[in-house]
């Protein structure tokens, strides 16, 4: 059975997966695919590593941690509702039927946008700049200070800027509410 993880539209989704390398540099191939783990390999592969490197990836999918240390957790950037579904992390351990398989169910929820009769600058207080840097290891949210005063026309520009700079917009744990008045 699959284990459920949640993210909101526009956030980054984090799907944890780990293995213990037999020795540093003695890596095991890993594949990530959309859909439950089949008998062999991964269906609809979105990312793959071999004994040395990430040798295949598709746009918006990357490894948040250091796969050389056994952290093969997947980050999906700027998720949409279409990203919902089951993902397979398959640790391809040599030998017949030795693979470790993890089916992770990703549930995408609509973004929380609550209109409220507040002044424009309340956006700043309600929406501190929460970013996840593309560092090593499990996702960690850091507050980098509040945004300057911002108007509605700047919101999409800001979102694009955060996405394009790979400083991923990750409000997963912040519980922040965007108030537009």
């Amino acid at each position: 059975s699959e284990v459920e993880y949640r993210a909101e539209v526009g956030q980054n989704a984090y799907l944890p997966c780990f293995y213990t390398p037999a020795a540093p540099g003695n890596l095991v191939p890993v594949c990530w695919g959309k859909g439950a783990c089949p008998v062999f390999e991964c269906g609809n592969v979105v990312l793959r590593t071999d004994e040395r490197d990430v040798n295949y990836w598709t746009s918006r999918y990357w490894l948040n941690g250091d796969f050389r240390k056994g952290d093969v957790s997947l980050t999906i950037e700027n998720v949409t509702l279409a990203d919902s579904g089951i993902y397979c992390c398959r640790i391809q351990i040599p030998g017949i039927m030795n693979d470790e398989k993890f089916n992770l169910k990703l549930v995408i929820k609509p973004a929380k946008v609550t209109p409220a009769p507040t002044r424009q600058r309340d956006f700043t207080a309600a929406f501190p700049r929460m970013l996840t840097t593309r560092g090593h290891g499990p996702a960690e949210t850091q507050t980098l200070g509040s945004l300057p005063d911002i108007n509605l026309t700047q919101i999409s520009t800001l979102a694009n800027e955060l996405r394009d700079s790979r400083l991923a917009n990750d409000l997963r744990d912040s519980g922040a509410t965007i108030r537009i008045g």
Epitope: V3, R68, E140
Partner: antibody
Framework: EVHLQQSGAEFMKPGASVKLSCTAS????????MHWVKQRTEQGLEWIGR????????KFAPKFQGKATITADTSSNTVYLQLSSLTSEDTAVYYC??????????WGQGTTLTVSS | DIQMNQSPSSLSASLGDTISITCHAS??????LSWYQQKPGNIPKLLIY???ILHTGVPSRFSGSGSVTGFTLTISSLQPEDIASYYC?????????FGGGTKLEIK
């Protein structure tokens, strides 16, 4: 054989800074995340933070951000924990440990830090 | 942060007993949970990782089970050398967090 050798006990005054060391043998620290864990007397374990010695990238528990700095010297296979603006709350045993990758399989013997005026 | 709630905080049992310690995560951590034993005056020692896998050299009377948010460490046929504190730890998300510990005593 894997071994983590930590520096000796420290007695410091409030407001001072201290730098603890942990030298690894039997493995290359570049192949692992290296962590520091705090344990106050008769209390539980508290994760401080970790470093990826490969590139120096660090992560910290929020309460130790600004208090702790973790560095690594790959040439000597050593990791360091620096604690600043010491108070009596920092009196504890500090362990260095390696993860593999998300659990701690080897631990140093611990360094006792006492902060007192 | 993911909170790890461990119970009981202390436990008294007789030699030969089977005891269980539970750990509850405040959110899904799949199987990315480890258990540690710390004997009085000693350093912590890894017992179990990935919720149920025994670390090398750990006696088979120790076992771990559970996934997602609920986990159990079971010690069967309690021995005198099992007197220790036991901690769970989640390694799925930073900051890593430990349970508050369970102090095991022999009656």
């Amino acid at each position: 054989e894997v071994h983590l050798q930590q520096s000796g006990a420290e007695f410091m005054k409030p407001g001072a800074s201290v730098k603890l060391s942990c030298t690894a043998s039997g493995f290359n620290i570049k192949g692992h995340y290296m962590h520091w864990v705090k344990q106050r007397t008769e209390q539980g374990l508290e994760w401080i933070g970790r470093i990826d010695p490969d590139d120096g990238a660090t992560k910290f528990a929020p309460k130790f951000q600004g208090k702790a700095t973790i560095t690594a010297d790959t040439s000597s296979n050593t990791v360091y924990l620096q604690l600043s603006s010491l108070t009596s709350e920092d009196t504890a045993v500090y362990y260095c440990t390696r993860s593999n990758p998300y659990y701690f399989d080897y631990w140093g013997q611990g360094t006792t830090l006492t902060v007192s005026s | 942060d993911i909170q790890m709630n461990q119970s009981p905080s202390s436990l008294s049992a007789s030699l030969g007993d089977t005891i269980s310690i539970t750990c509850h995560a405040s959110q899904n951590i799949n199987v990315w949970l480890s258990w540690y034993q710390q004997k009085p005056g000693n350093i912590p020692k890894l017992l179990i990782y990935k919720a149920s896998i025994l670390h090398t050299g750990v006696p088979s009377r120790f076992s771990g089970s559970g996934s997602v948010t609920g986990f159990t460490l079971t010690i069967s046929s309690l021995q005198p050398e099992d007197i220790a504190s036991y901690y769970c730890q989640q390694g799925q998300n930073y900051p890593y967090t430990f349970g508050g510990g369970t102090k095991l005593e022999i009656k």
